[in-house]
C-alpha cells in the first residue's frame, strides 16, 4: 500500500498487536496477566464452556451491530447465567396452566449472587430454546408485576422452523428492577399475541424445559437447556475503580 | 492545540468548510449550485415550511442516534408527505367503528407520485398527533393485509401527557410493499393492545383527525394535522446516476 | 461497503479492512486466555484522500466524496465502522471467568 | 463523552468536538439554500496518542486506553461518533424541494 510514503504493513501489524495487548488488559482492569500456577489441570469445566458458547453465539432477536459504546461499556463484562427455577417447584402451582401462556420463574438470590448491585448490570437476556415450529406464531413477553398482574415487555414474530433455535429477549431493565427490590422469586410469562377480535390464542411454540413425559436421559439434556438469564455485569471489584493493580477475587 | 507540530486551527476550519461545500453538492448530486433566477418572490409556501419543520423535529419513537449509513444513504433524500384520506371518505364505512381501533387510509396514487419506484424509498414514517392522554395506554399498529385481515407491525407504550405530541412509526417496509402492488387504497389500524385474559380493550388515546363535532375553523387546523406519511426518497433523476451535471426536474 | 467480503477479496489500495489473526500464545506470549486460542482482530488501513472541492474540480471530485470523505472532514481517516465483541475464558487463581470484551473485532472500515 | 457539552466548555487539548457554524451565505457564498440560513456543522480535532503498551509502562498507560485508543488502533484518529442529519429547503427552477442530508452535524467525537 502506498500513499506519499510507503506504508510498512508489518510495522502497522506490530503496533496493532501491541495495542491489543494493552487493550485486553485495560478492558479487564488488569495491570498484568493473572498467573496460571493454580489453574486446575484438564479441560475447562462443562458449565464454563456452556456459558462461553452461550455468549459467543448470536441468537434470534439479538442485534448484530453494536451501538457506539458508552464509556462504562469499554470495560469487560463478566458473564454468568441463572437457570429458571425447575417446573416442579411449587411457585408454578399458583399459575393456572393455560393454552396461551407459559411461565418462567427465577430465584433472585441467585441473581444477587451473580450481580450484587443493580448498577453493575449492563445487560440481561432471557434465552429460550424454541423447538421446531410448524406455523408462524406471534408471541409476547410479560413481566410479573404485582400479585396477579403482568406488564407487557416485548414481542416477537416467530417464523416456522424445522430445527431448534435459541431466542433472546433483552430484559436488562426488568432484572435491574428485581435486583433493587426485595422479592425472592420473580418471573416472566410468554403468551400468544391476542388480537382484540381474534379467537385463536393458543401458544403453538414449544419451549424447551416445559414438555413432559421424557425419557430420563433426555430430560436431563432438556433440563440443562431450560430457559435461563444470561447476565453481563461489571464485577464489583472492577467497579470500585481500584487504583491498585490487584487481581481481586 | 499542539501535537508534534502546532495545528493551524484556521486552516483546519477552512478545509472543513471547503469539504462541506463539496459534501452538500455531492449529496444532492449537483455539479454546481442551482440557479435562483426563477425562484418566486416572497416567503416560502406554508406547505413547504410545514414539511421542513416536520423533518426537522425529532418525534416520540424516532431514534436520535443514526445507524452507520449504507452507501445509498449518503445521498440526500427528498422529503414529501402524503396526508391520510379524510375520514368522510366511503372507504371508512367498510370498517365498523369499534372502541378498540381507529383506521387510517392512504391513496397509493399520491404515494406513487411522491415515490415512483419502491427501491427509491429510504424511509417512511407514519406520523400521528396524539392529543392529551389521561392514562398510560399500550397501542399496536397493524397493516391492512387482505380483505379483512390485519398484519401486526409494531407497538408503543404511551405515557400520560397534558400536551399534544407527535408519534412516529417506521413503516418503510409496508410503504415499499404498497408501491410494488396495484392497490388504490391501503391502510393502517391503530388498536389498543389486547391481552389474552384482559377485558378492558378500549383505545383511550385521542388521535388528531378523528374527533368529531368541531367548530369549522378548528376542524381546518385539525385536518391539516391529521395523520400523514412522511416519505424520504432518492429522486428518480438522482438515482439514475446521470453523469451529466444537469439539474433535471 | 469496506467490509471483510469486499476488502479481503480485493487489492484495494485505499481505506479498507485488513486481515489480522491474533494468536494469544504466539503473538502476545500469553497462555492465560483459555478460550478462544486467538481471534480475527483485523484493522483498518489505507488512505482517504482529502477532497478539495475547489470550483475547478467540482465535476471530477463529487463522485469521490461518498467513498473518500463522506463526513467532509478536514483530514479524513480510515477507521472501524462495524465492530463485534469477543468473549474470553480465563482463570483468576483457581476460579474460571467468562468475560465479554466489547468492540474487539473489526468487520468494516470507513473514511471519517 | 467527547460531546458538545464537554468539549465546548473545556480547554481539552486532545481529541474533542470543536465549534463551527457554517453560514451558507457568508462562508460558502451561497444564497440558494433557503432554509436553514446556516448550521452548526462542528468538527473533530485533537491528538489521540498511540499507546505503546510496552511492559515498563503498563500500569501508567492502562487507564489511558479508554480515552486515547479504545479500539487498539495502530494509529488512532479523532473522528465523529454521533452525527445528526440536516434538512434543507432549496429551489430547482420554480419548484421548492425539502431534502434531508444525512450525517451533517457532528455532536461528539472519539479516538478510533
Amino acid at each position: 500500500l502506498s500513499t506519499c510514503k510507503t506504508i510498512d504493513m508489518e510495522l502497522v501489524k506490530r503496533k496493532r498487536i501491541e495495542a491489543i495487548r494493552g487493550q485486553i488488559l485495560s478492558k479487564l482492569r488488569l495491570a498484568s496477566p493473572p498467573s496460571q500456577g493454580e489453574v486446575p489441570p484438564g479441560p475447562l469445566p462443562e458449565a464454563v464452556l456452556a456459558l462461553y458458547n452461550s455468549t459467543r453465539d448470536r441468537v434470534a432477536g439479538e442485534s448484530a451491530e453494536p451501538e457506539p459504546e458508552p464509556e462504562a461499556d469499554y470495560y469487560a463484562k463478566e458473564v454468568t447465567r441463572v437457570l429458571m427455577v425447575e417446573t416442579h417447584n411449587e411457585i408454578y402451582d399458583k399459575f393456572k396452566q393455560s393454552t396461551h401462556s407459559i411461565y418462567m420463574f427465577f430465584n433472585t438470590s441467585e441473581l444477587r449472587e451473580a450481580v450484587p448491585e443493580p448498577v453493575l448490570l449492563s445487560r440481561a437476556e432471557l434465552r429460550l430454546l424454541r423447538l421446531k415450529l410448524k406455523v408462524e406464531q406471534h408471541v409476547e413477553l410479560y413481566q410479573k408485576y404485582s400479585n396477579n398482574s403482568w406488564r407487557y415487555l416485548s414481542n416477537r414474530l416467530l417464523a416456522p422452523s424445522d430445527s431448534p433455535e435459541w431466542l433472546s429477549f433483552d430484559v436488562t431493565g426488568v432484572v435491574r428492577q428485581w435486583l433493587s427490590r426485595g422479592g425472592e422469586i420473580e418471573g416472566f410469562r410468554l403468551s400468544a399475541h391476542c388480537s382484540c377480535d381474534s379467537r385463536d390464542n393458543t401458544l403453538q411454540v414449544d419451549i424447551n424445559g416445559f414438555t413432559t413425559g421424557r425419557r430420563g436421559d433426555l430430560a436431563t439434556i432438556h433440563g440443562m437447556n431450560r430457559p435461563f438469564l444470561l447476565l453481563m455485569a461489571t464485577p464489583l471489584e472492577r467497579a470500585q475503580h481500584l487504583q491498585s493493580s490487584r487481581h481481586r477475587r | 492545540l499542539s501535537t508534534c507540530k502546532t495545528i493551524d486551527m484556521e486552516l483546519v476550519k477552512r478545509k472543513r468548510i471547503e469539504a462541506i461545500r463539496g459534501q452538500i453538492l455531492s449529496k444532492l448530486r449537483l455539479a454546481s449550485p442551482p440557479s435562483q433566477g426563477e425562484v418566486p418572490p416572497g416567503p416560502l409556501p406554508e406547505a413547504v415550511l410545514a414539511l421542513y419543520n416536520s423533518t426537522r423535529d425529532r418525534v416520540a419513537g424516532e431514534s436520535a442516534e443514526p445507524e452507520p449509513e449504507p452507501e445509498a444513504d449518503y445521498y440526500a433524500k427528498e422529503v414529501t408527505r402524503v396526508l391520510m384520506v379524510e375520514t368522510h371518505n366511503e372507504i371508512y364505512d367498510k370498517f365498523k367503528q369499534s372502541t378498540h381501533s381507529i383506521y387510517m387510509f392512504f391513496n397509493t396514487s399520491e404515494l406513487r407520485e411522491a415515490v415512483p419506484e419502491p427501491v427509491l424509498l429510504s424511509r417512511a414514517e407514519l406520523r400521528l398527533l396524539r392529543l392529551k392522554l389521561k392514562v398510560e395506554q399500550h397501542v399496536e399498529l397493524y397493516q391492512k393485509y387482505s380483505n379483512n385481515s390485519w398484519r401486526y407491525l409494531s407497538n408503543r407504550l404511551l405515557a400520560p401527557s397534558d400536551s399534544p405530541e407527535w408519534l412516529s412509526f417506521d413503516v418503510t417496509g409496508v410503504v415499499r410493499q404498497w408501491l410494488s402492488r396495484g392497490g388504490e387504497i391501503e391502510g393502517f389500524r391503530l388498536s389498543a393492545h389486547c391481552s389474552c385474559d384482559s377485558r378492558d380493550n378500549t383505545l383511550q388515546v385521542d388521535i388528531n383527525g378523528f374527533t368529531t363535532g368541531r367548530r369549522g375553523d378548528l376542524a381546518t387546523i385539525h385536518g391539516m394535522n391529521r395523520p400523514f406519511l412522511l416519505l424520504m426518497a432518492t429522486p428518480l433523476e438522482r438515482a439514475q446516476h446521470l453523469q451529466s451535471s444537469r439539474h433535471r426536474r | 461497503a469496506l467490509d471483510t467480503n469486499y476488502c479481503f477479496s480485493s487489492t484495494e489500495k485505499n481505506c479498507c479492512v485488513r486481515q489480522l489473526y491474533i494468536d494469544f500464545r504466539k503473538d502476545l506470549g500469553w497462555k492465560w486466555i483459555h478460550e478462544p486460542k486467538g481471534y480475527h482482530a483485523n484493522f483498518c488501513l489505507g488512505p482517504c484522500p482529502y477532497i478539495w472541492s475547489l470550483d475547478t474540480q467540482y465535476s471530477k471530485v463529487l463522485a469521490l466524496y461518498n467513498q473518500h470523505n463522506p463526513g467532509a472532514s478536514a483530514a479524513p481517516c480510515c477507521v472501524p465502522q462495524a465492530l463485534e465483541p469477543l468473549p474470553i475464558v480465563y482463570y483468576v487463581g483457581r476460579k474460571p471467568k467468562v468475560e465479554q470484551l466489547s468492540n474487539m473485532i473489526v468487520r468494516s472500515c470507513k473514511c471519517s | 463523552a467527547l460531546d458538545t457539552n464537554y468539549c465546548f466548555s473545556s480547554t481539552e487539548k486532545n481529541c474533542c468536538v470543536r465549534q463551527l457554524y457554517i453560514d451558507f451565505r457568508k462562508d460558502l457564498g451561497w444564497k440558494w439554500i433557503h432554509e436553514p440560513k446556516g448550521y452548526h456543522a462542528n468538527f473533530c480535532l485533537g491528538p489521540c496518542p498511540y499507546i505503546w503498551s510496552l511492559d515498563t509502562q503498563y500500569s501508567k498507560v492502562l487507564a489511558l486506553y479508554n480515552q486515547h485508543n479504545p479500539g487498539a488502533s495502530a494509529a488512532p484518529c479523532c473522528v465523529p461518533q454521533a452525527l445528526e442529519p440536516l434538512p434543507i429547503v432549496y429551489y430547482v427552477g420554480r419548484k421548492p424541494k425539502v431534502e434531508q442530508l444525512s450525517n451533517m452535524i457532528v455532536r461528539s467525537c472519539k479516538c478510533s
Epitope: Q36, R246, R248, R249 | - | G93 | -
Partner: antibody
Framework: EVQLVQSGAEVKKPGASVKVSCKAS????????MHWVRQAPGQGLEWMGR????????RYAQKFQGRATLTVDTSTSTAYMELSRLRSDDTAVYYC???????????WGQGTLVTVSS | DIQMTQSPSSLSASVGDRVTITCRAS??????LNWYQQKPGKAVKLLIY???VLETGVPSRFSGSGSGTDYTLTISSLQPEDFATYFC?????????FGQGTKLEIK
C-alpha cells in the same frame, strides 16, 4: 494501610511444635490467599504453602506436607502456621505474605524467628 | 520444580552507579517474574512484578526486562537506601520458587 503483623520470636526444642500467627488489616481478609515462606539463616526464601481464607482450601509444598498445618480465623482476620516435629534445620525466619493472582506476593509480614535448639 | 538461578550472589557498587542483577529460570516462565528487596529487620518489599511492572510507590530508577527464561533487574543510579538484598521469584508454576538472592553492598 495494608499490614500483616506477625507474632514474636520463639525458641523450641527438637520434636516440639510451633504456631506462628499473622494478623491482617487494611483489606478484606477473605479476598486474598495467605502464603507462608521461610528463610533459613544466610539462605534464600522457600515457599511452604497457602490457605484460601474464603473457602478454607489449602495447598502445601511437598516438603512440608504432613508437618505444616495452615488455619485461619476469619472473625479476627488472622492466619496461623503450625509446624510440628521440629528439627534444628527448621531454624528460620517465617513470613506470611499476601498473594496477588498476578503471581506475586505484594505484602509481607515482618517475619517471626523460630529457633530450634536442644 | 522450576529452579531459579540468580547472579551475582553479591555485588559492591557506589552511589550513582548503574547496577544489573540477572535471574535465569530452568524453563520458560512466560514473564511471571517478580523482584523483591529485603533489608535487615524490615518486611520484604515487592519492587517489580510480571517482569517489568513497577509496584506503586517504587522509584522509577528500578526497571525490569526479559522474557522466556532470562530476566534482569536494573537500578539506573544507585541511591544510599538501595543497598539491600534482592530476590527474584517465579509466579508461573507451583510451587513458587525464589532465587538465592543478591546482596548489594557499598563499595
Amino acid at each position: 494501610e495494608v499490614q500483616l503483623v506477625q507474632s514474636g520470636a520463639e525458641v523450641k526444642k527438637p520434636g516440639a511444635s510451633v504456631k506462628v500467627s499473622c494478623k491482617a488489616s487494611g483489606y478484606t481478609f477473605t479476598s486474598y490467599d495467605m502464603h507462608w515462606v521461610r528463610q533459613a539463616p544466610g539462605q534464600g526464601l522457600e515457599w511452604m504453602g497457602r490457605i484460601d481464607p474464603q473457602s478454607g482450601g489449602i495447598r502445601y509444598a511437598q516438603k512440608f506436607q504432613g508437618r505444616a498445618t495452615l488455619t485461619v480465623d476469619t472473625s479476627t482476620s488472622t492466619a496461623y502456621m503450625e509446624l510440628s516435629r521440629l528439627r534444628s534445620d527448621d531454624t528460620a525466619v517465617y513470613y506470611c505474605a499476601r498473594w496477588d493472582y498476578g503471581g506475586y506476593f505484594d505484602v509481607w509480614g515482618q517475619g517471626t524467628l523460630v529457633t530450634v535448639s536442644s | 520444580d522450576i529452579q531459579m538461578t540468580q547472579s551475582p550472589s553479591s555485588l559492591s557498587a557506589s552511589v550513582g552507579d548503574r547496577v544489573t542483577i540477572t535471574c535465569r529460570a530452568s524453563q520458560d516462565i512466560y514473564n511471571y517474574l517478580n523482584w523483591y528487596q529485603q533489608k535487615p529487620g524490615k518486611a520484604v518489599k515487592l519492587l517489580i512484578y510480571y517482569t517489568s511492572v513497577l509496584e506503586t510507590g517504587v522509584p522509577s530508577r528500578f526497571s525490569g526486562s526479559g522474557s522466556g527464561t532470562d530476566y534482569t533487574l536494573t537500578i539506573s543510579s544507585l541511591q544510599p537506601e538501595d543497598f539491600a538484598t534482592y530476590f527474584c521469584q517465579q509466579g508461573d508454576t507451583l510451587p513458587w520458587t525464589f532465587g538465592q538472592g543478591t546482596k548489594l553492598e557499598i563499595k
